[in-house]
Interface confidence: low
């Protein structure tokens, strides 16, 4: 539908509050280092301009594209070159190159200070003094640290953030009310950011076809009663939404997401029986709820897949006529029958099926050639099943912290060139798969575990892409989206790695460790563990365990000492010497 003014169209569709919030998110995700006040000023200028276009769509510049308007506005920032360096060169380009250039400069690991949570009373005072600024600051701080955060979902988080403060700042015990809610929002926010990052990586690195295949599989699992045509329509619309958000088109994305939620709710009878509750909620909650809705029950009388995809004499004819549609139907039919499989496994099966048809439909006897294609699926299914079984057993035996440590050692030996903070962050997240998924029954373990691991390994891939140091990581990250996890699983100890020089400073600790939270103390210990493995990649589990046990005892002892700093200095030297001896350093 044609609109004289795109900016007026989106302002009217979204309303002023959402329009301003989304423009702030967009600007903060592009210019991640800019001060809050500068962004607020830019957003206010854009909003005032949008209002003039709403009043008169023919007014000057109202016909310009959003990329042109927003890019022009970002390029007015005076300190662009000194703050962002070569990103300023983007401003010399025309659209769409300029926007592509801004996108390429988004930084997954910006050099920003850690967000420190103030005292509850301080936060409540700030909330009451100026609620609007307080909430804008939340959007700004999250968006600049997570430049691919799914913008309409961030509006939902902000709504919950506001609700938490509204409720808890008038509670008798403000802290008891507020802190658990903020912890939950923080953890959910990190997970949401990582999930969206994978969607954007999928679109940007592997293209629309890869994303659509993922969406066909996931939506077919979720809506197994929906017809293929219905699933295809949802996939096309969902792809458009995510392409827009990943491309920085946040107003279009939020608008189209709202339209998609509306469509799903208007057609829920032909989509899923599980949508009723979601569809009774307000817009932001509705969209979130639909995205998280449980899988509908599978239709009872689904016929065997073999009839249409192996036994039929028309397999090659159907495949040749419309390859992507036929493969899409295969994926849909397989996925709706297998809510117990991970999406990445379903995509591996579809890829195997495609490869087989490519080969066999050119053969003398195609049917004879592809007759056993389903037998090729067995090892592909068993590999993740066995891996999850082994790792859940290890998790149940060790508990989360020690399971994370086992993964830290495993991954540091595989890719020792990767930076220590990245190895710690990624291995800690990999280790969380245990508490997240091992509690589930067999039928839910694989989709939980393997699809979660895809999200975490994507974090490794995007962090590594910024400063590539390991050919093995690059290879696993770029060769195949669906085979990333098997690729990393298959890596053995890197025999080419030259151990890091021993540096006593790395293993020198101070009394400040005693005041850290349990989580931060764990990170300190895990950082030391990674460094140990980098110094001594051939160290055995037993050797590393002995050193780590000594280290834990040393921290505990010195944190109880009267003169903590002296204890850390003297006992630390002894610990380093003992560790060197134990590891033969």
């Amino acid at each position: 539908d044609a609109h004289k003014s795109e900016v007026a169209h989106r302002f009217k569709d979204l309303g002023e509050e959402n329009f301003k919030a989304l423009v702030l998110i967009a600007f903060a995700q592009y210019l991640q280092q800019c001060p809050f006040e500068d962004h607020v000023k830019l957003v206010n200028e854009v909003t005032e301009f949008a209002k003039t276009c709403v009043a008169d769509e023919s007014a000057e510049n109202c016909d310009k594209s959003l990329h042109t308007l927003f890019g022009d506005k970002l390029c007015t920032v005076a300190t662009l070159r000194e703050t962002y360096g070569e990103m300023a060169d983007c401003c010399a380009k025309q659209e769409p190159e300029r926007n592509e250039c801004f996108l390429q400069h988004k930084d997954d690991n910006p050099n920003l200070p850690r967000l420190v949570r103030p005292e509850v009373d301080v936060m409540c005072t700030a909330f009451h003094d100026n609620e609007e600024t307080f909430l804008k600051k939340y959007l700004y701080e999250i968006a600049r640290r997570h430049p691919y955060f799914y913008a309409p979902e961030l509006l939902f988080f902000a709504k919950r953030y506001k609700a938490a403060f509204t409720e808890c700042c008038q509670a008798a015990d403000k802290a008891a009310c507020l802190l658990p809610k903020l912890d939950e929002l923080r953890d959910e926010g990190k997970a949401s950011s990582a999930k969206q990052r994978l969607k954007c990586a999928s679109l940007q690195k592997f293209g629309e076809r890869a994303f659509k295949a993922w969406a066909v599989a996931r939506l077919s699992q979720r809506f197994p009663k929906a017809e293929f045509a219905e699933v295809s329509k949802l996939v096309t619309d969902l792809t458009k939404v995510h392409t827009e958000c990943c491309h920085g088109d946040l107003l279009e994305c939020a608008d189209d997401r709202a339209d998609l939620a509306k469509y799903i709710c208007e057609n829920q009878d032909s989509i899923s029986s599980k949508l009723k509750e979601c569809c009774e909620k307000p817009l932001l909650e509705k969209s979130h709820c639909i995205a998280e809705v449980e899988n509908d029950e599978m239709p009872a009388d689904l016929p065997s897949l073999a009839a249409d995809f192996v036994e039929s004499k028309d397999v090659c004819k159907n495949y040749a006529e419309a390859k992507d549609v036929f493969l899409g139907m295969f994926l849909y039919e397989y996925a709706r029958r297998h809510p117990d499989y991970s999406v990445v496994l379903l995509l591996r099966l579809a890829k195997t099926y495609e490869t087989t048809l490519e080969k066999c439909c050119a053969a003398a006897d195609p049917h004879e050639c592809y007759a056993k294609v389903f037998d090729e699926f067995k090892p592909l299914v068993e590999e993740p099943q066995n891996l999850i079984k082994q790792n859940c057993e290890l998790f149940e035996q060790l508990g989360e912290y020690k399971f994370q440590n086992a993964l830290l050692v495993r991954y540091t030996k595989k890719v020792p060139q990767v930076s220590t903070p990245t190895l710690v962050e990624v291995s800690r997240n990999l280790g969380k798969v245990g508490s997240k998924c091992c509690k589930h029954p067999e039928a839910k373990r694989m989709p939980c575990a393997e699809d979660y691991l895809s999200v975490v390994l994507n974090q490794l891939c995007v962090l590594h892409e910024k400063t590539p140091v390991s050919d093995r990581v690059t290879k696993c990250c770029t060769e195949s989206l669906v085979n990333r996890r098997p690729c990393f699983s298959a890596l053995e100890v890197d025999e080419t790695y030259v151990p890091k020089e021993f540096n006593a400073e790395t293993f020198t600790f101070h009394a400040d460790i005693c005041t850290l939270s349990e989580k931060e103390r764990q990170i300190k210990k895990q950082t030391a563990l990674v460094e140990l493995v980098k110094h001594k990649p051939k160290a055995t589990k037993e050797q590393l365990k002995a050193v780590m046990d000594d280290f834990a005892a040393f921290v505990e002892k010195c944190c109880k000492a009267d003169d903590k700093e002296t204890c850390f200095a003297e006992e630390g030297k002894k610990l380093v010497a003992a560790s060197q001896a134990a590891l033969g350093l």
């Epitope: 990329h67 592509e100 629309e208 076809r209 458009k240 390859k323």
Partner: nanobody, 115 residues
Framework: EVQLVESGGGLVQPGGSLRLSCAAS????????MSWVRQAPGKGPEWVSA????????RYAESVKGRFTISRDNAKKTLYLQMNSLKPEDTAVYYC????????GSQGTQVTVSS
């Protein structure tokens, strides 16, 4: 850098035909859906048609359905728009874009339908 260069526009009588081309460079053309967008004088951009990365899935605005056909040749990194039964209201500058965005940045190609 991303470049999209349209060609094939011109002056044509009502009922006539034109074939527009869009040559792409600087990105993995075969991995992205593409669209045609047009902008008539004094109006905002209007989405015309889209095609998915493989060329299997095509979509059209109601105003052009049955008259326009979108296609692509991934080997040649080129997008096409075959326009038949042209009407005066099809007069506009036509742009190709990545994805289904109506944002435009290339020069476009002018199509004028007039007797």
């Amino acid at each position: 850098e991303v470049q999209l260069v349209e060609s094939g526009g011109g002056l044509v009588q009502p009922g006539g035909s034109l074939r527009l081309s869009c040559a792409a460079s600087g990105f993995t053309f075969g991995s992205f859906g593409m669209s045609w967008v047009r902008q008539a004088p004094g109006k905002g951009p209007e989405w015309v048609s889209a095609i998915d990365s493989g060329g299997a899935d095509t979509r059209y605005a109601e105003s052009v359905k049955g008259r326009f056909t979108i296609s692509r040749d991934n080997a040649k990194k080129t997008l096409y728009l075959q326009m038949n039964s042209l009407k005066p209201e099809d007069t506009a500058v036509y742009y190709c874009t990545i994805g289904q965005s109506t944002s435009r940045g290339s020069q476009g190609t002018q199509v004028t339908v007039s007797s």
